[in-house]
């Protein structure tokens, strides 16, 4: 769909990120502890038989669940899937983890616990030492570092081999700040909150995180329905009522990894005006290069035209004129009772020689394989390091 340019398709972001094929070096794999050098973190590669055949922690994972295996991807990635195995060791290994938790970080300082769409943290793991169990991560996580925390229901040895699947997060978006989404009351309640937001919520404002507006999932024409199974009405959208904003607009701020020249912002909006949802009447964006700097120049203003009577959801493109910034603040003007967004993405180019915001610890990432990048995605570039894994079918224990 041409009108979806700038949005990525998470279904195509499922490439092995380098544990099994060793493009992730040993130095980027670590752990809270190891039983021995032969079960050190570096032996945690999926399908590998190195050492004694897996990573095994020194301490018990029952009852505290404090031991972890850490993988540093060096750059932000969208991680959509993980795979786990136990310790095979030529048939001698009997240790595996029946369940585990994941935690992730974009900067190595703030750690978030992965939860599924219903708030469940615990992931079903392996039933034997050798089989690979894949877990589709819904929602996916934008992360540089990922930690696996094996679990047990009694004192026992557990061991892990892992792989991560996804693609490089090239959008550069580190966080967005927005008012908390609200509830619309129709014949049933329609919950328009950002249910996967991984930042903080204080005083009706969400900040410091990412959520449904950056997960690649675009909402349906009828906002009461969802792309996801077994979720509540309104799930795909984040929405705000005009009644709650005397200013007449919703203000959001976007923080990026480094200085970028912004060509456009793509906002996927609902326009089911028979139920009160309307495209924004206009958008006004301001730009600045640093957090404590003044907003630079005149704001970019864009009035929306087009067929506003068409009730179909659509992506609205807001030209940003190549303005250079690391922070954007955008105001979305109400043109009706409700604003409903399902996705916001940006078309931008990194400004040469701009250093990353997250410390000086990011090396340049090579393309995999070497050569020109694919051109069909602007938010995410895929890393075709191997065959795409086949995910478990929806409804299976690990899907």
């Amino acid at each position: 769909d041409a009108d979806m340019k700038g949005h990525f398709d998470p279904a195509k972001c499922r490439y092995a990120l380098g544990m099994q094929d060793r493009t992730i070096p040993d130095s980027d794999i670590s752990a809270s502890s190891s039983w021995s050098d032969s079960t050190a973190a570096r032996h945690s590669r999926l399908e590998s038989s190195d050492g004694d055949g897996a990573w095994c922690p020194a301490g018990s994972v029952f009852p505290k669940e404090e031991e972890y295996l850490q993988v540093d991807l060096q750059r932000l990635h969208l991680v959509a899937l993980v795979g786990t195995q136990g310790r095979h060791a030529g048939g001698l290994g009997k240790e595996f983890s029946r369940s585990y938790r994941l935690r992730y970080s974009r900067d190595g300082r703030r750690w978030m616990g992965w939860k599924d769409r219903w708030g469940q943290e615990v992931i079903s793991g392996n039933e034997d030492p050798e089989g690979v169990v894949l877990k589709d991560l819904g929602p996916p996580m934008v992360a540089r570092l990922v930690r696996f925390y094996p679990r047990a229901d009694r004192v026992m040895s557990v061991c892990l081999r892992v792989e991560l699947y996804g693609c490089l997060w090239r959008d550069g978006l580190l966080s967005y700040t927005a008012p908390v989404g609200q509830t619309m009351y129709l014949s049933e309640a329609v919950y328009l909150n950002d249910s996967t937001y991984d930042g903080h919520t204080v005083g009706g404002l969400q900040y410091g995180g990412l959520g449904q507006l950056a997960d690649g999932v675009v909402g349906l024409d009828d906002f009461r329905k969802s792309q996801e199974l077994r979720v509540w009405p309104g799930y795909d959208y984040v929405g705000w009522s005009n009644h709650s904003f005397s200013s007449g607009y919703v203000e959001m701020e976007f923080e990026f990894d480094r200085l970028r020249a912004f060509q456009a912002m793509q906002v996927h909006c609902n326009n089911m005006h028979t139920l009160g949802a309307r495209l924004p009447g206009g958008v006004e964006c301001r730009f600045r290069r640093g957090p404590a700097m003044a907003w630079e120049g005149e704001p970019m203003r864009h009035n929306l035209g087009g067929n506003l009577g068409d009730p179909r959801a659509r992506a609205v493109s807001v030209p940003l004129g190549g303005r250079v910034a690391r922070f954007l603040q955008c105001r979305f003007l109400f043109a009706g009772p409700w604003l409903l967004f399902s996705e916001i993405s940006f078309i931008s180019d990194v400004v040469n020689n701009s250093s990353p915001a997250l410390g000086g610890t990011f090396p340049p990432a090579p393309w995999w394989p070497p050569g020109p990048p694919p051109t069909n995605f602007s938010s995410l570039e895929l890393e075709p390091r191997g065959q795409q894994p086949v995910a478990k079918a929806e409804g299976s224990p690990t899907a």
Epitope: A31, S32, D107, L145, L174, E255, G359
Partner: antibody
Framework: SVEESGGRLVTPGTPLTLTCTVS????????MTWVRQAPGKGLEWIGI?????LTYFATWAKGRFTISKTSTTVDLKITSPTTEDTATYFC??????????????????WGPGTLVTISS | ELVLTQTPASVSAAVGGTVTINCQAS??????LAWYQQKPGQPPKLLIY???NLESGVPSRFKGSGSGTQFTLTISDLECDDAATYYC????????????FGGGTEVVVK
């Protein structure tokens, strides 16, 4: 507990490494920070090493200091000290166990400090 | 770069009295602020975190408030033992802010 060591008198330009030795908790689960205080002055944040091993520094400290760790120690290296680096250097532990979703860097366990004097 | 400005630099009050110390941030830091007490020859001691949460073992006479860019530490029923220098400190929450300390406020108890 947390205890700093390695503070001494050195001449300008001579690299100096301070060591923070910890006990009773694991560095794989807590962030550790270095803060300094010049005589009669206020507290000045230098940098931090997360449980992940990644390091972050105050803007003014980038390139002037490095932080590294082992399983029980955290080192601060002053790469090329000047007289302005004369201070008491404190090592402190972040209060949040990093598996909490509360992630602000507040420091509730401090060492007594070690005095560094840079003089020719 | 985030700057925390503490006022006043010094304040004097009688035993049983109340002192108020202000901390202003150069940008919005939401509630990511801590207060410390430091006595001569000692390391700092955490009093308040998250702008208003009392650290374990700290008397309830210490109260933190504020959010965004304006924060306050109030010490009521002042005791001689409260004589110290007090510092505010920003907590990290994203790449746009990092740790910084205010310049300090000396509290003298008469």
């Amino acid at each position: 507990s947390v205890e700093e060591s390695g503070g001494r008198l050195v001449t300008p330009g001579t690299p100096l490494t301070l060591t923070c030795t910890v006990s009773g908790f694991s560095l794989s689960r807590y962030a550790m920070t270095w803060v300094r205080q010049a005589p009669g002055k206020g507290l000045e944040w230098i940098g931090i090493i997360g449980s992940s091993g990644l390091t972050y520094f105050a803007t003014w400290a980038k390139g002037r200091f490095t932080i590294s760790k082992t399983s029980t120690t955290v080192d601060l290296k002053i790469t090329s000290p000047t007289t302005e680096d004369t201070a008491t250097y404190f090592c402190a532990r972040g209060m949040w166990y990093d598996d909490s979703d509360d992630y602000e860097d507040y420091f509730n366990l401090w060492g007594p400090g070690t005095l560094v004097t840079i003089s020719s | 770069e985030l700057v925390l400005t503490q006022t006043p630099a010094s304040v004097s009050a009688a035993v049983g009295g109340t002192v108020t110390i202000n901390c202003q941030a150069s940008q919005n830091i939401y509630s990511n602020l801590a207060w410390y007490q430091q006595k001569p020859g000692q390391p700092p001691k955490l009093l308040i975190y998250g702008a208003s949460n009392l650290e374990s073992g700290v008397p309830s006479r210490f109260k933190g408030s504020g959010s965004g860019t304006q924060f306050t530490l109030t010490i009521s029923d002042l005791e001689c033992d409260d004589a110290a220098t007090y510092y505010c400190q920003s907590g990290y929450y994203s790449s746009s802010t990092d740790i910084a300390f205010g310049g300090g406020t000396e509290v003298v108890v008469k």
